[in-house]
């Protein structure tokens, strides 16, 4: 069987939505009303990896696009990017580690920890309209907590 994938949207703990900013970047900003249709819909795939009740390994692709969030070193720093893949081969159960995030849910908060770079998380800035990035600190200025809204496939 193919890997199971479910469609969802994400909002950070300040209720900012995620939208495309150019072909290979996401940004976070407050949306309402009709503008909500701009938000990115992810195809979240349940992939192979270490799993517990609170921690589930997932890959985050953009729905109906051959783009996946991935974590790579750039200038010696873990960096979040949107990576183009061959749609014939993705998604798959055994995703390369750079595509894998540990979806961690504790006390009403959802975090996405890079499997490739432990303790680095998908993050947004407090400021509006800034890029979504990989951050190495939790509980500081930057936001690492999200909510997830599942949508019909």
């Amino acid at each position: 069987a193919p890997v199971r994938s479910l469609n969802c949207t994400l909002r950070d703990s300040q209720q900012k939505s995620l939208v495309m900013s150019g072909p290979y970047e996401l940004k976070a900003l407050h949306l309402q009303g009709q503008d909500m249709e701009q938000q990115v819909v992810f195809s979240m795939s349940f992939v192979q990896g270490e799993e517990s009740n609170d921690k589930i390994p997932v890959a985050l692709g953009l729905k109906e696009k051959n783009l996946y969030l991935s974590c790579v070193l750039k200038d010696d720093k873990p960096t979040l990017q949107l990576e183009s893949v061959d749609p014939k081969n993705y998604p798959k159960k055994k995703m390369e580690k750079r595509f894998v995030f540990n979806k961690i849910e504790i006390n009403n908060k959802l975090e996405f920890e890079s499997a490739q770079f432990p303790n680095w998380y998908i993050s947004t800035s407090q400021a509006e309209n800034m890029p979504v990035f990989l951050g190495g600190t939790k509980g500081g200025q930057d936001i690492t907590d999200f909510t997830m809204q599942f949508v019909s496939s």
């Epitope: 069987a1 479910l6 469609n7 009403n108 959802l110 999200f146 909510t147 019909s152």
Partner: antibody, heavy 119, light 107 residues
Framework: EVQLVESGGGVVQPGRSLRLSCSAS????????MSWVRQAPGKGLEWVAY????????YYPDSVKGRFTISRDNSKNTLFLQMDSLRAEDTGVYYC????????????WGQGTPVTVSS | DIQMTQSPSSLSASVGDRVTITCRAS??????LAWYQQTPGKAPKLLIY???TLMDGVPSRFSGSGSGTDYTFTISSLQPEDIATYYC?????????FGQGTKLQIT
């Protein structure tokens, strides 16, 4: 023994609100995703709301989106369904069920609470 | 959305009979299927998940099989207490949807 006990159903006029509760016991509530499933009179089953074990993930079908809100209080082992702008087609028995998105199936169910929307 | 079509919608059988209910999905659901039993005035009860895995405590006369889009639920020897409506439900993607039900009666 797992127990799910719903309450809060009743007769309400169209456009009004109702809040359902589900009290859980016999399992570690905070470790389980929960859902509400409804059954219109003489009809089949419809999944109407889902919340993940910590409360950070939710789902609503288009039929209730924007009108229903699911929430939970893990400290009190209680699940809620706030139903606003009720319509006649929301009439039915509402079941609290354990399970949802990740496992997919519903392995424990409450006895149900009836909701009637009528003028 | 994936639609689930159950057949028959109702059936009558005698105690001891072998009873079969089928469920067809409008798309491949890769075995992500559950079967429920609902007796009159009661909540549904999960019998089978992942198309063929029996829940703990469910009698072995109940079984499930199938793959792709076509699934079967079987009661090998019908008992009086099996009088109920049976529902299939897929959970391959969102929304998880139920079949319309099969009402089982004893002749």
């Amino acid at each position: 023994e797992v127990q799910l006990v719903e309450s809060g159903g009743g007769v309400v006029q169209p456009g009004r609100s109702l809040r359902l509760s589900c009290s859980a016991s016999g399992f570690i509530f905070s470790k389980y995703d929960m859902s509400w499933v409804r059954q219109a009179p003489g009809k089949g089953l419809e999944w109407v709301a889902y919340i993940s074990h910590g409360g950070a993930g939710t789902y609503y079908p288009d039929s209730v989106k924007g009108r229903f809100t699911i929430s939970r209080d893990n400290s009190k082992n209680t699940l809620f369904l706030q139903m606003d702008s009720l319509r006649a087609e929301d009439t039915g028995v509402y079941y609290c069920a354990r399970g949802g998105v990740y496992k997919g199936y519903f392995d424990e169910w409450g006895q149900g609470t009836p909701v009637t929307v009528s003028s | 959305d994936i639609q689930m079509t159950q057949s028959p919608s109702s059936l009558s059988a005698s105690v001891g009979d072998r009873v079969t209910i089928t469920c067809r999905a409008s798309g491949n659901i890769y075995g992500w299927l559950a079967w429920y039993q609902q007796t009159p005035g009661k909540a549904p009860k999960l019998l089978i998940y992942q198309a063929k895995t029996l829940m703990d405590g469910v009698p072995s006369r109940f079984s499930g099989s199938g793959s792709g889009t076509d699934y079967t639920f079987t009661i090998s020897s019908l008992q009086p207490e099996d009088i109920a409506t049976y529902y299939c439900q897929h959970f391959w993607n969102i929304p998880a949807t139920f079949g319309q039900g099969t009402k089982l009666q004893i002749t």
